[in-house]
């Protein structure tokens, strides 16, 4: 069942899902000047059976100007540098070792993907919060939010996290500081991945956080 509202906003924090519950939908959005191929699905869908979950459909973008030219889903070699794919993969090695049953991992990027990812979460999904660079986490409890359903209405639990401004950067235990821009990342405002205009920052922060959560959650 789709969550019909958004994870809570926490000032000076971003949220991230470690893994996506079956039923999660990801919009196939393309960057400016590109559009989804006509025959393409508007969404990727996390589906699975008892043993394996994966993303159904592949997002494909084509130039808005071009007619019947479809772009490959896999980034070209020259794209990989721009997308920091190798760095992201190395950061995610630990995360990839753990596979949550009934969940999909972060889908790989597709060529000419938009700079932000829009996810539609389902009931039971957990997202994790992290203070942006330059802010320290004050924990009163778990820095996470879960989508729950009561009387047919969905709501996200309130994460027990306050991000306080301090000069020294905040670090979660056992985690290196993510390489974010000097100004930090903007707040997320809908059910999205970290909202930012720089895909490189976005993927690095996402990957670092994913590693952090896996290393702590399963200790």
């Amino acid at each position: 069942e789709l969550c019909d509202d958004d994870p809570p906003k926490i000032t000076h924090a971003t949220f991230k899902a470690v893994a996506y519950k079956e039923g999660t939908m990801l919009n196939c959005e393309c960057k400016r000047g590109f559009r989804r191929i006509k025959s393409g699905s508007p969404y990727m869908l996390c589906t699975g059976n008892s043993s394996h979950s994966s993303w159904d459909n592949q997002c494909q973008c084509t130039s808005s100007a071009a007619r019947n030219t479809t772009k490959q889903v896999t980034p070209q070699p020259e794209e990989q540098k721009e997308r920091k794919t190798t760095e992201m993969q190395s950061q995610m090695q630990l995360a990839d070792q753990v596979s949550l049953p009934g969940h999909c991992r972060e889908p790989p990027p597709w060529e000419n993907e938009a700079t932000e990812r829009i996810y539609h979460f389902v009931v039971g999904q957990t997202v994790y919060y992290q203070c942006v660079q330059g802010y320290r986490a004050l924990h009163r409890g778990p820095a996470e939010s879960v989508c729950k359903m009561t009387h047919g209405k969905t709501r996200w639990t309130q994460p027990q996290l306050i991000c306080t401004g301090e000069t020294e950067p905040s670090q979660f235990p056992g985690e290196e500081e993510p390489q974010a821009s000097p100004d930090g990342l903007p707040e997320s405002e809908t059910s999205r991945l970290v909202t930012t205009t720089d895909f490189r920052i976005q993927t690095e922060v996402a990957a670092t956080m994913e590693t952090f959560i896996f290393t702590t959650e399963y200790q």
Partner: antibody, heavy 116, light 106 residues
Framework: QVQLVQSGAEVKKPGSSVKVSCKAS????????MHWVRQAPGQGLEWMGY????????EYNQKFKDKATITADESTNTAYMELSSLRSEDTAVYYC?????????WGQGTLVTVSS | DIQMTQSPSTLSASVGDRVTITCSAS?????MHWYQQKPGKAPKLLIY???ELASGVPARFSGSGSGTEFTLTISSLQPDDFATYYC?????????FGQGTKVEVK
């Protein structure tokens, strides 16, 4: 009590546009998405899309992506749906419905008739 | 898109009858929701999350099912129950409704 009050019936010419409003009261407008549902004469219900009034984010049924534009005005607690390039097939009753899960509150509906 | 097929499309019944409406989804869904609509009126939430009665809905209404097959039952049809009933899924976008089942006087 929660109420969704929609604008009155409209008769429009083919090719023109129409903007239907839905004024919410009795709850915090920005806390719930507002969905729009269409019902052609004698037909069933079709989901068109929603808006998150707090962020302005919209999600559309692909069928209506080029037909409908959903907006919201926080200051007046009102959601809008504009229909463009009207054709006779767009003749229908358009409902707004409060989201946040199942549609527990609906507007009374706005009949849009497209006729030359 | 998930297609929702209701049967029957029209059902002729008398007051006191037990009425059953089925809804079949083209793919497995987590829950089914049901709405009742009367002519010239907006739909009204009847049953949510497959089997829970919405506020003010009489206990003669019940819902059941899972996966792709769901059922709405009215144990003893009352005069106020003659209406059109729609099943609805919100497990995936686009949200979809069944084509409706009209319960009319026999």
């Amino acid at each position: 009590q929660v109420q969704l009050v929609q604008s009155g019936a409209e008769v429009k010419k083919p090719g023109s546009s129409v903007k239907v409003s839905c004024k919410a009261s009795g709850y915090t407008f920005t806390s719930y998405r507002m969905h729009w549902v269409r019902q052609a004469p004698g037909q069933g219900l079709e989901w068109m899309g929603y808006i998150n009034p707090s962020s302005g984010y919209t999600e559309y049924n692909q069928k209506f992506k080029d037909k409908a534009t959903i907006t919201a005005d926080e200051s007046t607690n009102t959601a809008y749906m504009e229909l463009s390039s009207l054709r006779s097939e767009d003749t229908a009753v358009y409902y707004c419905a409060r989201g946040g899960g199942v549609f527990d509150y609906w507007g009374q509906g706005t009949l849009v008739t497209v006729s030359s | 898109d998930i297609q929702m097929t209701q049967s029957p499309s029209t059902l002729s019944a008398s007051v006191g009858d037990r009425v059953t409406i089925t809804c079949s989804a083209s793919s497995s869904i987590s829950y089914m929701h049901w709405y009742q609509q009367k002519p010239g009126k907006a739909p009204k939430l009847l049953i949510y999350t497959t089997s829970e009665l919405a506020s003010g809905v009489p206990a003669r209404f019940s819902g059941s099912g899972s996966g792709t097959e769901f059922t709405l039952t009215i144990s003893s049809l009352q005069p106020d129950d003659f209406a059109t009933y729609y099943c609805h899924q919100r497990s995936t976008y686009p949200l979809t409704f069944g084509q409706g089942t009209k319960v009319e006087v026999k």
